[in-house]
């Protein structure tokens, strides 16, 4: 009987990330008796909801229930029935819904009301749907990666869990890129901040953290592209937009009404003598980079130093985990390796963007054309954002680690959000008594 395992008491939690381009459902599990330990919660499932983000359902709210069905049914299958009623479900909506709310609180409320009604029909313990703030999105992403990297643990390990984990307790900064916003969060060297709006204080596991965070709404990759198009069409002489951010030979018709649908393009809005225009790709990385840089206003800074658009940014400090679309895009481009220098990334981007569209389509036959066509822009945008926006350099580039998963759990804000809402991150270091967590008798 000495080595016979007792049945473990397992708990589950569900978080839906209602992003601007899609919704993902994450299922987490952890041993009940260890819920205050660091690093014990892990992801068991990710289910990507078929369809666009919830903000796109404003004209068809009656379809939201069906939209969520498959992933909620998947959760029903994965989580044991006996656990359903005590499994919390949280939905957090991010920048896509922030933009909808900016246009109309009524429409945003209506979408969330229907989402809440739909999720309440399942046998789980539904805890509500809300639009999280940009600050929360940044903070919870930072908590997630550092929790998964074991940075909050007081026990120093003689081994490393993940390749880029150092044995020191210095936290990683978090770089998150979505479709509609991007977040940067890290612990700066200097504890005093010039901008209180960007300052957060946490006490986690007995240690105080003074964290800088900012969320740049409209600077996610999709909204950045809309901004660039709106900016460039202003100076087009006719309804043809020769665009360096798309492959040579690529053509696409864009409706002007779609271009001006988002608040992100408001500053570029003008009366155009046409209802549609055609993007014609010319595939030139350098010109694309120049065009992207025009989205960042670096001429105005009311602080000692800024990122862009007059937003305070302290000097960068330590290593950074870059996740979500930072990872998806760079992984597609095969540029996530620690060994690839910034110069090499730029070189590869030049080569990739200049490849003819027909050639690209053949090489990546399994990839949807809509996504495939935008990798040149997205890769260029990521480089511009990191280098000119956040002031990484060729030297500090090696401190950026493109991360998809850590220990099988996706890097992103959802885990941090759940840990916070379920009170699983104690302010003080829990006292672990000998054998208190033993599952062997």
């Amino acid at each position: 009987t000495q080595n016979k395992a007792l049945p473990e008491n397992i708990k589950y939690g569900i978080v839906l990330d209602a992003g601007s381009s899609h919704t993902s459902l994450y299922i987490y599990k952890w041993p009940a008796e260890k819920e205050n330990d660091t690093g014990v919660v892990h992801q068991v499932e990710e289910c990507r909801v078929k369809g666009p983000g919830i903000s796109k359902y404003v004209q068809k709210v009656n379809e939201i229930g069906i939209y969520l069905t498959d992933c909620m049914e998947r959760a029903r299958e994965v989580i044991p029935r006996s656990q359903h009623q005590e499994t919390p479900v949280y939905l957090g909506a991010t920048a896509g819904m922030r933009l909808l709310r900016m246009e109309s609180e009524e429409l945003a409320d209506r979408v969330l009301d229907v989402v809440e009604r739909s999720l309440s029909n399942y046998p789980f313990d539904f805890q509500g749907a809300r639009i999280i703030t940009g600050q929360e999105e940044g903070a919870y992403g930072w908590i997630t990666i550092n929790y998964l990297l074991g940075k909050f643990s007081q026990k120093t390990r003689w081994f490393s869990i993940v390749p880029y984990e150092t044995n020191n307790q210095e936290t990683f900064g978090a770089l998150d890129l979505g479709g509609a916003s991007t977040q940067i969060t890290f612990v700066p060297q200097n504890q005093t901040t010039e901008s209180p709006d960007n300052a957060l204080q946490f006490r986690l596991y007995g240690k105080d953290y003074n964290v800088y965070t900012h969320s740049f709404l409209c600077y996610g990759k999709d909204q950045a592209l809309w901004q660039k198009l709106a900016k460039d069409i202003q100076v087009a002489s006719n309804e043809i937009l020769r665009d360096p951010c798309f492959h040579p030979g690529y053509k696409k018709v864009v409706n002007v009404s779609d271009l001006y649908k988002t608040p992100c393009t408001k500053r570029f809005e003008m009366t155009l003598p046409f209802q549609q225009f055609e993007i014609q790709g010319i595939g030139n990385y350098q010109q694309c980079h120049q065009s992207v840089l025009e989205l960042f206003n670096t001429s105005y800074c009311p602080y000692s130093q800024c990122a862009f658009n007059g937003i305070f940014l302290p000097p960068l400090q330590g290593d950074f985990g870059a996740f979500s679309a930072f990872y998806f895009v760079m992984n597609f481009l095969n540029l996530t390796s620690e060994k690839v220098s910034q110069e090499k990334v730029t070189e590869m981007m030049k080569k990739f963007c200049s490849q003819p569209w027909e050639e690209i389509k053949t090489s990546y036959a399994g990839v949807k054309e809509k996504y495939l066509s935008e990798y040149c822009f997205s890769g260029t945008y990521i480089l511009s954002l990191l280098l000119q926006g956040y002031h990484f350099t060729a030297d500090s580039w090696e401190h950026i680690h493109f991360i998809g998963k850590i220990q099988g759990s996706d890097a992103g804000w959802t885990l941090g959000y759940m840990l916070n809402l379920t009170n699983m991150i104690p302010a003080e270091q829990p006292l672990s008594t000998p054998l208190s967590h033993s599952t062997y008798v």
Partner: antibody
Framework: QVQLVQSGAEVKKPGASVKVSCKAS????????MHWVRQAPGQRLEWMGY????????TFNQKFKGRVTITRDTSASTAYMELSSLRSEDTAVYYC?????????WGQGTLVTVSS | DIVMTQSPDSLAVSLGERATINCRAS??????????MYWFQQKPGQPPKLLIY???NQGSGVPDRFSGSGSGTDFTLTISSLQAEDVAVYYC?????????FGGGTKVEIK
């Protein structure tokens, strides 16, 4: 809690310009549009326009087009409304109001008197 | 522009009695299943206070005696049991399309 605090009363001569400020607190300034509404003595409320503080884009009531400018300073969480070529009929209380389509929060109002 | 016509211009009601104010839009203010119709209360020397949004939803901290109804072009604000503190001017507003427009106001007094 959300607060919008406006600048003090102004007396201006016809033909001059006036610039009214509206300082926001208690929320993320760039997450909501800021509207300007005026009310002449004994008259109905009149919407003038709004700014998207996030990027400075703005939309105006055509009635004021060319005379009204709405700007913002995100570092100070402040929106500004400037009305030029003032005439006596511009004498009114000017309000800022936060919202996309729902004006749930209003400034206390700024009385602008145009008189020779 | 969408013209908002309020009726009556003024209304005198006894304390504890029901007060009803109507607002008609020159065209529908509904979009995506939402009525972009709002009711405000304004007391002398004060900014307007949001009472009702989306035609029928109560603003935060608004007493239950205030309710809104209607859709399309015809809307009603009802004060179920008039209190002394309800003496004010009431305005309707549409934000379906720019320029956003207000009604002419209804002055509510105690009879």
């Amino acid at each position: 809690q959300v607060q919008l605090v406006q600048s003090g009363a102004e007396v201006k001569k016809p033909g001059a310009s006036v610039k009214v400020s509206c300082k926001a607190s208690g929320y993320t300034f760039t997450d909501y549009n800021m509207h300007w509404v005026r009310q002449a003595p004994g008259q109905r409320l009149e919407w003038m326009g709004y700014i998207v503080p996030l990027n400075g884009g703005s939309t105006f009531n055509q009635k004021f087009k060319g005379r009204v400018t709405i700007t913002r300073d995100t570092s100070a969480s402040t929106a500004y409304m400037e009305l030029s070529s003032l005439r006596s009929e511009d004498t009114a209380v000017y309000y800022c109001a936060r919202g996309g389509t729902r004006f749930a929060y209003w400034g206390q109002g700024t009385l602008v008197t145009v008189s020779s | 522009d969408i013209v908002m016509t309020q009726s009556p211009d003024s209304l005198a009601v006894s304390l504890g009695e029901r007060a009803t104010i109507n607002c008609r839009a020159s065209e529908s203010v509904d979009n995506f299943g939402v009525s972009f119709m709002y009711w405000f209360q304004q007391k002398p020397g004060q900014p307007p206070k949001l009472l009702i949004y989306g035609a029928s939803n109560q603003g935060s901290g608004v007493p239950d005696r205030f309710s809104g109804s209607g859709s399309g072009t015809d809307f009603t604000l009802t004060i179920s049991s008039l209190q002394a503190e309800d003496v004010a001017v009431y305005y309707c507003q549409q934000t379906k399309e720019v320029p956003y427009t207000f009604g002419g106001g209804t002055k509510v007094e105690i009879k």
